[in-house]
């Protein structure tokens, strides 16, 4: 396990409707790891979210991070969010910790869609 997981993208863009209930999955993020088997298993988490509005859970089958709405959003109050996520290996033996000190991070821009005024296409 001498490879740490690295995000495929340094920046993601997601949208969420202000009518979405808490617990809604609003999108996925993905990292890759050149190891195999359990050494490639990873855990996603929030590194920065001042608003404490979002959470990330890990789908251990697909190794994707799922961005979850933790608190309902209100378009009039705030309609743009930015959060930073990080990813780490699930299993890291003590002797290989030196390869995993700096977790890979990605930034996620989240745009709230007004239920009264859907986005223009």
């Amino acid at each position: 396990n001498d490879n740490k997981p690295i995000f495929k993208e340094s920046l993601y863009r997601l949208t969420v409707s202000e009518s979405a209930p808490t617990g809604t999955s609003i999108g996925t993020i993905m990292a890759y790891d050149n190891d195999i088997g359990e050494n490639a298993e990873m855990d996603y988490s929030i590194e920065e979210d001042d608003s404490q509005t979002f959470d990330i859970i890990t789908n251990h089958e697909t190794q994707e991070g799922i961005v979850i709405l933790k608190k309902k959003v209100d378009f009039e109050h705030q309609n743009h969010y930015g959060i930073r996520a990080k990813v780490k290996n699930h299993h890291v033996p003590e002797q290989l910790m030196k390869y995993h000190t700096e977790a890979s991070t990605t930034f996620i821009k989240i745009q709230v869609e007004d239920v009264d005024e859907p986005p223009v296409f």
Epitope: R13, T15, N79, H80, G82, F107
Partner: antibody
């Protein structure tokens, strides 16, 4: 380094439609996660955000201008455009195009701006 | 919409002095959603600070940002001749609005 360049007529008659184009170089307008905005500044005054577009065509406008604004994107030309209808002298301004940042919605890259005067 | 108020309107200082510029929001905003720009005559604004204390690429460390809630500050620790300009704050949490600007001119 991303560069943006505005182009379009410098003079528009009242009640007509102002049309400007922003050409992006040094990067792709289809880059994931970036939004492309128009911002204006009347002579001697402050800055006003007009609206933005994502490369997919999804746009969001300043509520105060929404009824008159259309922003579109042409990924094949690496350009995005602004149309502002029914203009008056109050729309005279320097118009800037801009791209947001890699860790937030602040405006990281700006064009040099183009002055549009509304006058008959 | 969130209205940003900047004070003072004009700040007259000499090179080498410390400049403290204030930006006040009409309601509370997260500190992660505030930026500062510098604009010189005939030029586009230039991003200085975002988040509200991260310096943009190439911005000297004499520029610093701080604040939370409704009150934010841009500090220029020691004014250089090239720092005399207009400074704008911007919030980007609830749509996008700019303050009216503070002009820093030479005393």
């Amino acid at each position: 380094q991303v560069q943006l360049q505005e182009s379009g007529p410098g003079l528009v008659k009242p009640s007509e439609t102002l049309s400007l184009t922003c050409t992006v170089s040094g990067g792709s307008i289809s880059s994931s996660g970036y939004y492309w905005s128009w911002i204006r500044q009347p002579p001697g005054k402050g800055l006003e955000w007009i609206g933005y577009i994502y490369y997919t065509g999804s746009a969001y406008y300043n509520p105060s201008l929404k009824s008159r604004v259309t922003i579109s994107v042409d990924t094949s030309k690496n350009q995005f455009s602004l149309k502002l209808s029914s203009v008056t002298a109050a729309d005279t301004a320097v118009y800037y195009c801009a791209r947001d940042g890699s860790s937030g919605w602040y405006f990281q890259y700006w064009g040099q701006g183009t002055l549009v005067t509304v006058s008959s | 919409e969130i209205v940003l108020t900047q004070s003072p309107g004009t700040l007259s200082l000499s090179p080498g002095e410390r400049a403290t510029l204030s930006c006040r929001a009409s309601r509370q905003i997260s500190s992660s959603y505030l930026a500062w720009y510098q604009q010189k005559p005939g030029q586009a604004p230039r991003l200085l600070i975002y988040g509200p204390s991260s310096r943009a690429t190439g911005i000297p460390d004499r520029f610093s940002g701080s604040g939370s809630g409704t009150d934010f500050t841009l500090t220029i620790s020691r004014l250089e001749p090239e720092d005399f300009a207009v400074y704008y704050c911007q919030q980007y949490g609830s749509s996008f609005t700019f303050g009216p600007g503070t002009k820093v001119d030479i005393k």
